[in-house]
């Protein structure tokens, strides 16, 4: 679950930056891809590839884009309205209990076991005992968040809460 957004998650805008488009709030809210100015009079655009906002909002700052870690691939780039989608590289996975890095999937099952589940970005291969059918590794939960590396932002399986 994402933590409360803190100052470092927000991307302060330079008010004087000429490339930032301004418009007026509609009923006190600014459209996706913008945040509201401190005086509440203007909507200031987020910076493409740097920060974003997803909804009509009265945020004083746009949210900072997630950067994919090494070992992750970028499935979808950060835009002014959507955060980055990152995912563990093929052949690696990220577990709930070790979310800090993508780990290599096993190449095969131990002797006496058979593979019943492939390597995915969220789980190692799944092996069961040939006779009993009992699992060697824990089951993946039914629903999880898109994972993003930064709090308050979903990212890909590796870093989104999808």
């Amino acid at each position: 679950e994402s933590a409360l957004i803190t100052q470092q998650d927000l991307a302060p805008q330079q008010r004087a930056a000429p490339q930032q488009k301004r418009s007026s709030p509609s009923e006190g809210l600014c459209p996706p891809g913008h945040h509201i100015s401190e005086d509440g009079r203007d909507c200031i655009s987020c910076k493409y590839g740097q920060d974003y906002s997803t909804h009509w909002n009265d945020l004083l700052f746009c949210l900072r884009c997630t950067r994919c870690d090494s070992g992750e691939v970028e499935l979808s780039p950060c835009t002014t309205t959507r955060n980055t989608v990152c995912q563990c590289e093929e052949g690696t996975f990220r577990e709930e209990d070790s979310p800090e890095m993508c780990r290599k999937c096993r190449t095969g099952c131990p002797r006496g076991m058979v593979k019943v589940g492939d390597c995915t970005p969220w789980s190692d291969i799944e092996c069961v005992h040939k006779e009993s059918g009992t699992k060697h590794s824990g089951e993946v939960p039914a629903v999880e968040e898109t994972v993003t590396s930064s709090p308050g932002t979903p990212a890909s399986p590796c870093s989104l809460s999808g």
Epitope: S2, D9, L63, L75, G152, P154
Partner: antibody
Amino acid sequence: QVQLQESGPGLVKPSQTLSLTCTVSGGSISSGGHYWSWIRQHPGKGLEWIGYIYYSGSAYYNPSLKSRVTISVDTSKNQFSLKLSSVTAADTAVYYCARDDSSGWGFDYWGQGILVTVSS
Amino acid sequence: DIQMTQSPSSLSASVGDRVTITCRASQGLRNDLGWFQQKPGKAPKRLIYAASSLQRGVPSRFSGSGSGTEFTLTISSLQPEDFTTYFCLQHNSFPWTFGQGTKVEIK
């Protein structure tokens, strides 16, 4: 794991106000970046997005329902609520609450829904 | 509003079959589209986000593709638990809108 649960009366009389509450467990409604929505599904039909609210209290509504809808939030109870005024039989539907994921990729968690019938 | 046209509205298939469901948008969405599974009396469950990214914990037999105005959900090999309803959601522009749903039934 985040869970959402809708509650409220299952029967509302025409012209009255429909009131529903969504209780969030397994996570804070104030956690940054998430917006909290109401959606409804008329019997045998598709889904309709009603509106959302942020923990700060700022809300945005579907223009088709805006004149009748109010969504509010109570962070101390980890709840958000829907009020729909001047209801008619056409407002009979299953009402869902849902959470938008914080990266802008749509709803990641939903409640199981509550059927509200408008009838005298 | 963006109109989402989902097809087919229903289909009959057998366990092991490959199934494809389509959503067409009345205007371009980039990749701002999700796919959901809805079982009777249960909370809808997200399968795919960002048009093609698989939700954590969702079996890899589910996949999504497309961008712009045409999107597909594919189930590569239907399992008994997959016989239910699926719908798409566009979240490119407000108000967000949904496909009408596709009911996957046992042949």
